[in-house]
């Protein structure tokens, strides 16, 4: 799976959308490695 910064950002945005934004405060692209997905 794609691990570039842009891919990570888009995947995180999708995850936030599906979760209704209910995630940890530090769950942001620059803190989240590709392994989180």
């Amino acid at each position: 799976s794609c691990n570039t910064a842009t891919c990570v950002t888009h995947r995180l945005a999708g995850l936030l959308s599906r979760s209704g934004g209910v995630v940890k405060d530090n769950f942001v692209p620059t803190n989240v490695g590709s392994e989180a997905f």
Partner: antibody, heavy 119, light 107 residues
Framework: EVQLVQSGAEVKKPGASVKVSCKAS????????MNWVRQAPGQCLEWIGD????????NYNQKFKGRATLTVDKSASTAYMELSSLRSEDTAVYYC????????????WGQGTTVTVSS | DIQMTQSPSSLSASVGDRVTITCKAS??????VAWFQQKPGKAPKSLIY???YRYSGVPSRFSGSGSGTDFTLTISSLQPEDFATYYC?????????FGCGTKVEIK
């Protein structure tokens, strides 16, 4: 309102260096990667690299490796792109860009900085 | 590096026309493709990400499709403000690479 505001136009001599700044506002600067892209007159867009403002990690296009340096000043919410050993082919408009999720999911770009390399 | 080949390089169209721009990647990039619109003297404006998702505020007449190596941007009914140059970009692999643009001109 999210904004990326870049520094003004520069004219440089061949062999010199240039440092372009990109001041971010309206979002948490350290949460999102910052990209740098350039566009030479009549040429394709070229990706220079990206930087993680939180940790300082960088990815560079090998074409610019060793000549381009990406840095940030977290306290000033500002990203920098320095390009050294300038040549005439580096004459271009340089852009910073960042994909933001909060407050608005969008790919924001700076207004561009024209760098002219001429003897 | 992955090459992104756009076609056509330019096209002439009229208001109301359906316009299709294609982008071919030199290797598989899954759906990790973005499309941008640029007007003279302005920064590129993002339209589409992940091949087919419109950013908020982008009119529904813009749509993207494709996966793997072949991608398409379609403008269903061209409006006066749509005359511009359009670029594709892959972000599946470093370095990110762009197509060289399709200029949409008034017929």
């Amino acid at each position: 309102e999210v904004q990326l505001v870049q520094s003004g136009a520069e004219v440089k001599k061949p062999g010199a260096s240039v440092k372009v700044s990109c001041k971010a506002s309206g979002y948490t600067f350290t949460d999102y990667y910052m990209n740098w892209v350039r566009q030479a007159p009549g040429q394709c867009l070229e990706w220079i690299g990206d930087i993680n403002p939180n940790q300082g990690g960088t990815n560079y296009n090998q074409k610019f490796k060793g000549r381009a340096t990406l840095t940030v000043d977290k306290s000033a919410s500002t990203a920098y792109m320095e390009l050294s050993s300038l040549r005439s082919e580096d004459t271009a408009v340089y852009y910073c860009a960042s994909i933001i999720i909060v407050p608005n999911y969008f790919d924001y770009w700076g207004q561009g900085t024209t760098v002219t390399v001429s003897s | 590096d992955i090459q992104m080949t756009q076609s056509p390089s330019s096209l002439s169209a009229s208001v109301g026309d359906r316009v299709t721009i294609t982008c071919k990647a030199s290797q598989n990039v899954d759906t990790n493709v973005a499309w941008f619109q640029q007007k003279p003297g302005k920064a590129p404006k993002s339209l589409i990400y992940s091949a087919s998702y419109r950013y908020s505020g982008v009119p529904s007449r813009f749509s993207g499709s494709g996966s793997g190596t072949d991608f398409t941007l379609t403008i269903s009914s061209l409006q006066p403000e749509d005359f511009a140059t359009y670029y594709c970009q892959q972000y599946n692999n470093y370095p990110y690479t762009f197509g060289c643009g399709t200029k949409v001109e008034i017929k």
